[in-house]
């Protein structure tokens, strides 16, 4: 904490500008008015302050807003956001998507920090649900965002938001997460025709039950092996050899390369050898 000292004569800051970079920490503390800083936060990012100087500026804002910063200040924090702790951020009430974008931009290219995770959590909780625009924004900055949420958190995603989800956004989702997302995707895409529906639903099929896979097998979808490998083991096991052959179409030959991996291995083990032989792939049950 910077000691309280009187501001030297002629050094009182009239505005936030480049001259302040030559101020010592104690001079910043004594000569910069917190209210001035708050109204001119947008200028701070254009000035090459040292980390130590930024600490002083943060301290001034903390004193001015002990209950948490107003959104007008938060939106212009820029690199000062990196100085915030999750505890600081928990005091905020961020409602504007523009504010969220501005702060995410500061952290762009880095992994999701505890600060960013707290910010997103505060924002989403404030909105009550993960709407399409928010999801669009978050997955643009963090493709793995959706899969970082718990199944409980994912349950607040409305089916309409599913349209914003790209295949790569689901890459790291586990079965419990896809169990929640799949029914929402099914609902979101229900009015699409067969081939278009399959293109959209494909990424979510890791949460599909056996009945839906059986239905897809009747639609000549030609599922690729990468998608098949992501299916739930318990959904795959009841499928017959004929159903898997129809589901995969020309891709059925790929089963041979995956015969030692789950869920293919478990499925092969549970089939009659005579049925497996009809595939002509040399699979051993």
């Amino acid at each position: 904490e910077v000691e309280k000292t009187a501001c030297p004569s002629g050094k009182k800051a009239r505005e936030i500008d480049e001259s302040l970079i030559f101020y010592k920490k104690w001079e910043l503390e004594a000569c910069v008015d917190a209210a001035l800083l708050a109204t001119q936060m947008d200028r701070v990012n254009a000035i090459p302050f040292t980390y130590e100087q930024l600490d002083v500026l943060k301290h001034k804002l903390d004193e001015l807003y002990p209950q948490g910063y107003p959104e007008s200040v938060i939106q212009h924090l820029g690199y000062l956001f990196l100085k915030m702790s999750p505890e600081d951020i928990r005091k905020w009430n961020v409602t504007s998507l523009e504010t969220l974008k501005a702060l995410l931009e500061v952290n762009k290219g880095h992994e999701m920090s505890p600060q960013v995770a707290t910010l997103i959590d505060r924002f989403v909780k404030g909105r009550g649900q993960l709407d399409k625009d928010t999801l669009d924004t978050l997955t643009a900055f963090y493709p793995g965002y959706l899969c970082s949420l718990s199944p409980e958190e994912l349950s607040s995603v409305p089916p309409s938001s599913i349209w914003a989800v790209r295949p790569q956004d689901l890459d790291t989702c586990d079965p419990r997460q896809l169990d929640v997302l799949y029914p929402k995707a099914r609902l979101a895409f229900q009015n699409m025709n067969g081939s278009e529906y399959f293109v959209k639903i494909q990424s979510f099929l890791g949460g599909a039950p056996t009945e839906d896979l059986k239905a897809l097998s009747q639609q000549n979808v030609s599922m690729d092996l990468a998608t098949f490998m992501k299916l739930r083991t318990d959904a795959v096991l009841p499928l017959t050899v004929a159903e898997v052959q129809k589901l995969l179409g020309p891709h059925v030959e790929g089963l041979k390369a995956e015969e030692r991996h789950r869920p293919v291995r478990d499925w092969i083990l549970r089939q009659r050898q005579d049925d497996l032989d009809t595939l002509g792939l040399g699979l051993q049950g």
Partner: antibody, heavy 119, light 107 residues
Framework: QVQLQESGPGLVKPSETLSLTCTVS??????????WSWIRQPPGKGLEWIGY???????NYNPSLKSRVTISVDTSKNQFSLKLSSVTAADTAVYYC???????????WGQGTMVTVSS | DIQMTQSPSSLSASVGDRVTITCRAS??????VNWYQQKPGKAPKLLIY???SLQSGVPSRFSGSGSGTDFTLTISSLQPEDFATYYC?????????FGGGTKVEIK
Amino acid sequence: QVQLQESGPGLVKPSETLSLTCTVSGGSVSSRDDLWSWIRQPPGKGLEWIGYIYYSGSTNYNPSLKSRVTISVDTSKNQFSLKLSSVTAADTAVYYCAREDALTGFDIWGQGTMVTVSS
Amino acid sequence: DIQMTQSPSSLSASVGDRVTITCRASQSSRYYVNWYQQKPGKAPKLLIYAASSLQSGVPSRFSGSGSGTDFTLTISSLQPEDFATYYCQQSYDASYTFGGGTKVEIK
């Protein structure tokens, strides 16, 4: 409630064959849902999977032990067995039998039986 | 074979601590990774299956996460009965492999 119990000699001479049996009670070795494995743990060391068998007789072995291992199943006795040939002192371990559900993992284990290889 | 590398090999912690154990697979194991707890002289006990699903009867302070090659077991608030050795295991590839184990000791 499925329970597993290992049985077999606690002492085996080098170059001989180690034979163990796992008896399944409270469930069936013929269950289509389950795989039946053998796992071992040398004193003070970690776990090593030996192999599994399905009720149909299909087996899968650890490549490092494959040439010496045979796992078989006897559905009439509700048992599955392990044979490990040409043993050496390095095979001294606690041997566990375990059930694996394809959806979970090794959810049920026997209490383990210590096998020492020594002359 | 897929090698499972666990870290740390041992750690000291106090009751109430948050403990994190990691397991790295030499190639993708998708989400087919399980976690076990073993106490001296006892058989291992399944805690977490399919990377993040809690086995029935296991306290909710245990949680798992990860997919692909990096997996984590977390104990949110360590209890006296949690001092044990923990193992990860992959079952994606037909040659099942275990991690080397992490011994959690009392500080």
